[in-house]
């Protein structure tokens, strides 16, 4: 289903992945693809193979080296085909001049502790996986706390304007569950998107002391 | 935004060859992937051919690859396809079209945001 409407999209983490989506209409779901990566100034190609995620999409990682090591500068341009088979041969069905750097989409940050807890306050950190060292200090973080009876998409977003990797949290209520998460983004990138979010981190602030509030 | 205009199309016998141009505007253009459709009498507008901004990566349609070439020339934001060994069955109107910016060619229409207003080409038996 050639004609089905298709979209092909892909992110780099800033060290040694690419992954990439590729959806289209009408198309066969055991139709066997993969993704070709072939750098401009890389004496390395990479491939790998679409798998499906939903009905009409399928994805893939590219994994170009070690998680922390540095595969691709901002002068890279890594020219992407995916490849369908059709009988004997690969057909191409997309194709993509990617500058990594304008196309960045970074892992969730990990690590997330509580630091310290009180009635009324929480103090959180975090760590961010797999950033490249390029960015320096231009990262910024999105926050959301879930309260009870309330939904993520509910809660509302604090935003971190800086390379900032922690948190307090103020004005909770004592004694009440809560859970929280947090994604980071580099300013740097015209097609650049916001990382996935974190696993949420649950915590309990402490109840209120009988007769005085801490 | 894009502006596309095509030129080079006209009317030719079979086996012979045409070379269609498309003229972009815009200062975005050499960072497009860059797409060519076809549409003849009676049919849907069908993929032709596409190329990536640094003329790197290509892609035809089955029905012409090996006869058609497609290619690019950034410096003076132009875009051309090679048609050559041409068939009846080739004659339609010829469409340049410029895909989404930051954005792969693939050979749906839904892809590309901008369109010339075509070329006629004609391939007489």
């Known amino acids: 289903a050639v004609n089905g409407t298709s979209q092909f999209t892909c992110f780099y983490n800033s060290r040694a992945n690419i992954s990439c989506v590729w959806s289209q209409d009408g198309a066969l779901q055991d139709t066997s693809c993969q993704v070709h990566a072939w750098p401009d100034r890389r004496r390395w190609n990479q491939t790998c193979e679409l798998l499906p995620v939903s009905q009409a999409s399928w994805a893939c990682n590219l994994i170009l080296g070690a998680p922390d090591s540095q595969k691709l500068t901002t002068v890279d341009i890594v020219t992407l085909r995916v490849l369908c088979r059709e009988g004997v041969r690969w057909r191409v069905m997309a194709i993509q001049d990617f500058k990594p750097f304008e196309n960045l989409r970074l892992m969730a940050p990990i690590s997330l502790q509580v630091v310290h807890v009180e009635t009324h306050r929480c103090n959180i950190s975090w760590e961010i996986s797999q950033a490249s060292h390029y960015f320096e200090r231009h990262l910024e973080f999105e926050a959301r706390t879930l309260s009870p009876g309330h939904t993520w998409e509910e809660a509302p977003l604090l935003t971190l304007k800086q390379k900032q990797e922690w948190i307090c949290l103020e004005t909770l209520t004592p004694d009440t569950q809560y859970e929280f998460q947090v994604r980071v983004k580099p300013l740097q990138g015209e097609f650049t998107t916001w990382s996935p979010w974190s696993q949420p981190l649950a915590f309990r602030t402490k109840p209120a002391a009988l007769g005085k509030d801490t | 935004e894009v502006q596309l205009v095509e030129s080079g199309g006209g009317l030719v016998q079979a086996g012979g060859s045409l070379r269609l141009s498309c003229a972009a505007s815009g200062r975005t253009f050499s960072t497009t992937e860059m797409g060519w459709f076809r549409q003849a009498p009676g049919k849907e507008r069908e993929f032709v051919a596409a190329i990536t901004w640094t003329g790197r990566g290509t892609m035809y349609a089955e029905s012409v690859e090996g006869r058609f070439t497609i290619s690019r020339e950034n410096a003076k934001n132009m875009v051309y396809l090679q048609m050559n060994s041409l068939k009846p069955e080739d004659t339609a109107i010829y469409y340049c079209?410029?895909?989404?910016?930051?954005?792969?060619?693939?050979?749906?229409?839904?892809?590309?945001?901008?369109w010339g207003q075509g070329t006629q080409a004609t391939v007489s038996s």
């Open positions: 079209a410029a895909a989404r910016r930051g954005r792969a060619a693939v050979r749906s229409e839904g892809g590309y945001d901008f």
